[in-house]
């Protein structure tokens, strides 16, 4: 489906007609005439084809969060445990097992 496709190619649908199409997580560099990795520019350059990828990259570094490709934003796993996507499985399953969440013994 289109959603699955977008999960696998987060920036794939962002490519403009003026640019050459590049593999996932890459952008077209007109000066070099080749596709370049988005990772190289995430910290210092604005590149529209990499915007979603760069945000997802920084989001992955935050514990208990995942990058939602439909919302194009970093979402907290805590708010959706129970109907969570696979990216939150580790967080939500650990949360469930954690004794902190058990009711206090009387």
């Amino acid at each position: 489906s289109r959603v699955d496709q977008e999960e696998r190619f987060p920036q794939g649908l962002w490519t403009g007609v003026a640019m050459r199409s590049c593999p996932e997580e890459q952008y077209w560099d007109p000066l070099l005439g080749t596709c370049m990795s988005c990772k190289t520019i995430c910290n210092h350059q604005s590149q529209r084809t990499c915007a979603a990828f760069c945000r997802s990259l920084s989001c992955r570094k935050e514990q208990g969060k995942f990058y939602d490709h439909l919302l194009r934003d970093c979402i907290s796993c805590a708010s959706i445990c129970g109907q969570h996507p696979k990216q939150c499985a580790y967080f939500c399953e650990n949360k469930l097992r954690s004794p902190v969440n058990l009711p206090p013994e009387l």
Epitope: V3, L13, R48, A51, D68, L71, R72, I75, H84, P85
Partner: antibody, heavy 118, light 107 residues
Framework: EVQLQQSGPELVKPGASVKISCKTS????????MHWVKQSHGKSLEWIGG????????SNNQKFKGKATLTVDKSSSTAYMDFRSLTSEDSAVYYC???????????WGQGTLVTVSA | DIVMTQSHKFMSTSVGDRVSITCKAS??????VAWYQQKPGQSPKLLIY???TRHTGVPDRFTGSGSGTDYTLTITSVQAEDLTLYYC?????????FGGGTKLEIK
């Protein structure tokens, strides 16, 4: 044909809550995020937040945190926005809006006018 | 948050004229700009996205351009039905923000 049908106008008292609905048709509800946008009389557009219908995760404008709660009912392909502790500042037209394959609003509901008055 | 500034709240024009509505972003939004038209009592309608791509069914007299922080919506030959409100919108990063709007009026 993609359609977003919103609930009718609301006249509410200060301090009360209101729940606006946005019934969708013409597309697969779970494949797109649904967003809500506020437009005060004679003013510009303000993004409130959006929801992913698959798991109910939300992306919010901090300004509306604690004020708006977004939910969905997948069985009826309907999105809802709960707006609480209403004041005169909340009197506005509220739109549900769906973006397409890219993050801009290609489809809009007809708007719901909310009037907060004692 | 990215602030979108439409410096002209009102712009005067005549039918048949060419008019350009401008919008400035507070940071580089890498052509992630959309333009909407809103007629009185109606919902906003998407005209342009990715700064220059015309939405389906939008007449070719509407053209978008720009890059970096500066963006323009141009109507090459203004029609009577175009005399209404226009908003720019950045779809680069959340929170998604809109310009204050520019109203096209008859000269």
């Amino acid at each position: 044909e993609v359609q977003l049908q919103q609930s009718g106008p609301e006249l509410v008292k200060p301090g009360a809550s209101v729940k606006i609905s946005c019934k969708t048709s013409g597309y697969t509800f779970t494949e797109y995020a649904m967003h809500w946008v506020k437009q005060s009389h004679g003013k510009s557009l303000e993004w409130i937040g959006g929801i992913n219908p698959n798991h109910g995760g939300t992306s919010n404008n901090q300004k509306f945190k604690g004020k708006a709660t977004l939910t969905v009912d997948k069985s009826s392909s309907t999105a809802y926005m709960d707006f609480r502790s209403l004041t005169s500042e909340d009197s506005a037209v509220y739109y549900c809006a769906r973006w397409g394959t890219d993050p801009f609003f290609a489809y809009w509901g007809q708007g719901t006018l909310v009037t907060v008055s004692a | 948050d990215i602030v979108m500034t439409q410096s002209h709240k009102f712009m005067s024009t005549s039918v048949g004229d060419r008019v350009s509505i401008t919008c400035k972003a507070s940071q580089d939004v890498s052509t992630a700009v959309a333009w909407y038209q809103q007629k009185p009592g109606q919902s906003p309608k998407l005209l342009i996205y990715w700064a220059s791509t015309r939405h389906t069914g939008v007449p070719d007299r509407f053209t978008g351009s720009g890059s970096g922080t500066d963006y323009t919506l141009t109507i090459t030959s203004v029609q009577a039905e175009d005399l209404t409100l226009y908003y720019c919108h950045q779809h680069y990063a959340p929170p998604w923000t809109f310009g204050g709007g520019t109203k096209l009026e008859i000269k």
